[in-house]
Each structure stands twice: as C-alpha cells, then as structure tokens.
C-alpha cells in the first residue's frame, strides 16, 4: 500500500480549525494477523529524507497521537489527552486518516507528517509516510478561511519508506 497526501499545503488564519488528511491507497490486508499503527508528528523542512525528524505536535509525541487497529476499521484517538490540546486524529473505513487541530495559532505552522505502519505478527513491518505543510497566517493578507493547495500527482503518489 501507499499513502497519498491530497494537499501539500494548508494556509489558515489564526483561530481557525484545520483537518490535515492522508489517504491509504492500494490493497490493504485485512487478515487477523495484520494491524495498522497510524500517527502524526511534526518534522523539519530541509531534510534530505522528508519526515526523518520526529517532533511533537502541541507537546504531544507521535506515541500520544497514535491509532492502532486492523484493516479498514475506523478509529479515533483517546479523547482526554489529545482533546485537551485541541487535537484529534481519526481514521475511517475508506482509508482516510486525519488529524484535526483546533484554534490554530502561529506556533502551529510547520511540516506535518502522517505515518502508517502495517504490522504483521511474527513478520516484518511495512511503514510509509506522507508530508504536508501548514502555514498559519496573521494580519490583513491572511485568508479568511483555510486555503488548500493540491499536491501534484507526483507528490501525492510519492511515498518514501520510513
């Protein structure tokens, strides 16, 4: 399977909410011995290997934000810790995988990475990631609502094994 990022850039005004999205593409094994670990973290521009650096999102690490489930099951993060930080990650039956960030501030600007790990019990794991940028803007030339920039077809299909 692969991960697609429908949008490479989200530009939002302060105070807005945004949902960053990744999508699983290709065949997904729904066997009993296969589970999926999905999570989000921040990274840095300039890395030769995109998403190689893992930084917390609003002080929550990728372990705090992870989802763990089988096949195309739906899942949400545990509400307490994440929601206290204005965050919620979710996964649906169609392979969509997202993180919602509420009440954006300038501090939220940065490069965000989704990570999906397919774990086969007693076997190796397969991991892929997608990257997108969030820019929170201020002042008179900030947009009134979030503006999204679609990934080029090459971007959205271009996934690097982590």
């Amino acid at each position: 399977f692969k991960v697609a990022t429908p949008y490479s850039l989200y530009v939002c005004p302060e105070g807005q909410n945004v949902t960053l999205t990744c999508r699983l593409l290709g065949p997904v094994d729904k066997g009993h011995d296969v589970t999926f670990y999905k999570t989000w973290y921040r990274s840095s521009r300039g890395e030769v290997q995109t998403c190689s650096e893992r930084r917390p999102i609003r002080n929550l690490t990728f372990q705090d934000l992870h989802l763990h489930h089988g096949g195309h099951q739906a899942a949400n993060t545990s509400h307490d810790l994440a929601q206290r930080h204005g965050l919620e990650s979710a996964s649906d039956h169609h392979g969509n995988f997202s993180i919602t960030m509420r009440n954006l501030t300038l501090l939220d600007s940065g490069l965000y990475c989704c990570l999906v790990v397919e774990i086969r019990h007693h076997h190796s794991e397969h991991r892929v990631h997608g990257a997108m940028e969030l820019q929170v803007q201020t002042g008179k030339d900030a947009p009134s609502n979030c503006v999204v920039y679609p990934s080029s077809s090459q971007d959205s299909e271009n996934i690097t094994a982590a």
Partner: antibody, heavy 119, light 105 residues
C-alpha cells in the same frame, strides 16, 4: 512594494562568526518563509536554509546544520542568518529571498551581502 | 538528495538566435523554476512551476518539461539576455543546478 534590504559587507577571520541581517517591508512579515542562499565567487547558488517568521520554524540544509542559525525580530521585520566557525570557503555573497506561499520559489531577493573570510 | 545538472555549461550564441537550456534531475521533482542572474546582481525569477512566465518577463522566454527533464527556451535572443541561468527545485529540500552561462558568440 516588497523590499528586502540586507546589511553591509563583512570581513571576518577564520573561526569567527558572522551575522547578516535582512529587513523586510511592503508585506506581512510573519506570513512568508524567508530563505538564505549563498554564492561563492564565480560559483553557483547554494541553499542554506529558511525561517518562517510567524513562529520561528526553521529548516536547514544538512551541510550547514550546527553551524548556521536563523532568527527573526518581528518588531523590526528583520531576519538574521548567523554562520559560525567560518573558513575561507565561506567567502561568498549571501542573499535573503522570500518564498511566495504555495509555490516553493523565490519571488523577491535581497541585494546580497559579501562576507569575506581571510586571515 | 536530488541533484540538478544543467547543460550545456556554456552556450555561445548571437542575438536573434534561439537558445535552449536543459536541466536534468536525478529523480522526479514536483516543481522546477528558472532564474536569470547578471553580474553583480541578485537572481531574478523567470519561469515558475516549469512553464509559467513570471511577472514582467518577456514572452520570448518559455519553459517546458516534467518529471526529470526540463527546458528553458529563449526564442530570439536580445542583448540583455546574456547572463547565467539557474534551475531550482523543491521536493522537501531545495537545490539549484550549477548554472548555464549564455554568452555572446
């Protein structure tokens, strides 16, 4: 209109540090990535890194990581690039350049600052 | 890391001639841009996203290509076009080609 005005030429000794400034005007400073690109005499362009003034998020070329620091002062709409442990091969013109949102290209450039490293 | 290779390194032509500059990437890139630089000046954006003409740039300049191979074409050279041209890409990090010097024959 958008303007990027850089500080003047510097002469430094090997091992020293240099701090170059780039003052922005004509747009909302916090909303656009600012990059630093250098050019050694007779050579091509080399990307060093960038800073997002809204929250000081940075991204550096691995080649310069540990030696370069980019900062900003929102009160004066100025970004700074400090390069430490200078060597003779750091002699170059250093440019700041604004990245247009959503494009990944540089639409405005500073005039350049010549940094000479010589003993 | 994606490496951009420009060819030729130097191109000698006369005013009125057509110039074709190439930029090749070691792997597929999302965005390719072209800049012009004259001696003692900062670079100036010519073409963005492979084929779009930047503001104020004459229509004799054009860009094409996708994936790993890109071309900058100047249909009929004017005296002020003799300069160094750089291609530039972003795919998580930024790199420039080494430049093509366009000189008067």
């Amino acid at each position: 209109q958008v303007q990027l005005v850089q500080s003047g030429a510097e002469v430094k000794k090997p091992g020293a540090s240099v701090k170059v400034s780039c003052k922005a005007s004509g747009y909302t400073f916090a909303n656009f990535w600012m990059h630093w690109v250098r050019q050694a005499p007779g050579q091509g362009l080399e990307w060093m890194g960038a800073i997002f003034p809204g929250n000081s998020d940075t991204g550096y070329n691995q080649k310069f990581k540990g030696r370069v620091t980019m900062t900003r002062d929102t009160s004066t709409s100025t970004v700074y690039m400090e390069l430490s442990s200078l060597r003779s091969e750091d002699t170059a013109v250093y440019y700041c350049a604004r990245e247009l949102t959503g494009t990944y290209y540089f639409d405005y450039w500073g005039q350049g600052t010549l940094v000479t490293v010589s003993s | 890391e994606i490496v951009l290779t420009q060819s030729p390194a130097t191109l000698s032509l006369s005013p009125g001639e057509r110039a074709t500059l190439s930029c090749s990437a070691t792997s597929s890139v999302s965005y390719m841009h072209w800049y012009q630089q004259k001696p003692g000046q900062a670079p100036r954006l010519l073409i963005y996203s492979s084929s779009n003409l930047a503001s104020g740039i004459p229509a004799r300049f054009s860009g094409s290509g996708s994936g790993t191979d890109f071309t900058l074409t100047i249909s009929s050279l004017e005296p002020e076009d003799f300069a160094v041209y750089y291609c530039h890409q972003w795919s998580g990090h930024f790199t420039f080609g080494q430049g093509t010097k366009l000189e008067i024959k």
